[in-house]
């Protein structure tokens, strides 16, 4: 697998997409994991809903969300309030039994905010508003965020 680089700005959200063959991975749950070292294990961060038919519902683990468009074949991971320690190598995975297929290897890079906001209003990251369905599958350690609460690029 080639590694795809996704660049996000510190303090903002980063959306990572992992396309896949929807028929080949039909019925399979998905996961997002962080690679520990070059040849180390991939530590699970968050996985899609236990019921595959509800994979479209966003699930949260802390500041990381996952949602799966099983018809279109796109797994989407959102990293909110991106921090320098979030930089690193990750994988999108398709789960079957105790096995996991790698859908995409992702290198997350965290950029300092280059924009100059001295003369501009705050910029806020584009975010989808949380729906009731999303909220009830969030892990207890995450909190509901008001729309516009996630910072978008500040300016330098």
């Amino acid at each position: 697998h080639n590694t795809t680089v996704f660049q996000g700005v510190a303090g903002q959200s980063l959306q990572v997409s992992c396309p896949y063959d929807s028929m080949k991975h039909w019925g399979r749950r998905k996961a997002w994991c962080r690679q520990l070292g070059e040849k180390g294990p991939c530590q699970r961060v968050v996985s899609t809903h236990n019921l595959w038919l509800l994979s479209f519902l966003r699930r949260w683990n802390g500041s990381t969300a996952i949602t799966d468009d099983t018809l279109g074949g796109t797994l989407t991971i959102t990293l909110r309030n991106l921090q320098p320690h979030d930089a690193g190598l990750y994988q999108c995975q398709s789960l079957h039994g105790s096995e996991a297929d790698t859908l995409r290897k992702v290198l997350v890079e965290v950029l300092a905010d280059p924009l100059d906001h001295r003369d501009a209003g705050d910029l806020w990251f584009p975010g989808e508003s949380e729906s009731f369905e999303d909220a009830h599958v969030e892990h207890s350690i995450s909190r509901s965020l008001l729309e516009g609460e996630i910072p978008f690029p500040p300016t330098s």
Epitope: T4, V5, F6, Q7, G8, V9, Q12, Q15, V16, S17, E109, L111, P114, L115, D116, A120, G121, D122, L123, W124, F125, P126, G127, E128, G148, F152, P153, T155, S156
Partner: antibody
Framework: QVQLVQSGAEVKKPGASVKVSCKAS????????IHWVRQAPGQGLEWMGI????????SYAQKFQGRVTMTRDTSTSTVYMELSSLRSEDTAVYYC?????????????WGQGTMVTVSS | EIVLTQSPGTLSLSPGERATLSCRAS???????LAWYQQKPGQAPRLLIY???SRATGIPDRFSGSGSGTDFTLTISRLEPEDFAVYYC?????????FGGGTKVEIK
């Protein structure tokens, strides 16, 4: 498919204003930043500013501060760039461009460009 | 403002040859903040490379980017007829984001 369609060419007199539109289609309008970049005839590219279609917040290049205004209409998935106090040096092709998910400050999908001519 | 200087201004090569384009920044730019574009006459630019070395979606692997600090390079390993165009580098390390003056790759 994903595309940005811009309004047609404009001819303006010095001191006037111009408003260029950029209609997005084929993707979720509020999930991607839109930038404006211009190119004078036979010249290079110049970044003007950025708008977040979700909240409407903006950041402009200092050179254009006070003269440029970027707005959006989410009901029509359209972004607007208005440039005032036009002078002959503003004669250029104006492009709107979308930032990809992979990197928020580069431009992967571009409009076809709008030629703005400033002449007395 | 970070000034980007591209060289050479024009590069005359034949199809199949290797093209090496240079972009020099007036101050150090992290490699994460540099992009390359291709522009053909009458068309909008096309994103080739971001983060100095990551190819954008759909870009052939004959295009590669490298460099860090103040010196960056775009390499086209084997020129195809459709590669003859103007190439621009862009930095996004600081506002305003700026572009180089461009390098024209023409058929020899």
């Amino acid at each position: 498919q994903v595309q940005l369609v811009q309004s047609g060419a404009e001819v303006k007199k010095p001191g006037a204003s111009v408003k260029v539109s950029c209609k997005a289609s084929g993707y979720t309008f509020t999930s991607y930043y839109i930038h404006w970049v211009r190119q004078a005839p036979g010249q290079g590219l110049e970044w003007m500013g950025i708008i977040n279609p979700s909240g409407g917040s903006t950041s402009y290049a200092q050179k254009f501060q006070g003269r440029v205004t970027m707005t959006r209409d989410t009901s029509t998935s359209t972004v607007y760039m208005e440039l005032s106090s036009l002078r002959s040096e503003d004669t250029a092709v104006y492009y709107c461009a979308r930032a990809p998910q992979e990197s928020p400050y580069v431009f992967d999908i571009w409009g076809q460009g709008t030629m703005v001519t400033v002449s007395s | 403002e970070i000034v980007l200087t591209q060289s050479p201004g024009t590069l005359s090569l034949s199809p199949g040859e290797r093209a090496t384009l240079s972009c020099r920044a007036s101050q150090s730019v992290s490699s994460s903040y540099l992009a390359w574009y291709q522009q053909k006459p009458g068309q909008a630019p096309r994103l080739l490379i971001y983060g100095a070395s990551s190819r954008a979606t759909g870009i052939p692997d004959r295009f590669s980017g490298s460099g860090s600090g103040t010196d960056f390079t775009l390499t086209i390993s084997r020129l195809e007829p459709e590669d003859f165009a103007v190439y621009y580098c862009q930095q996004y390390a600081g506002s305003p984001f700026t572009f180089g003056g461009g390098t024209k790759v023409e058929i020899k």
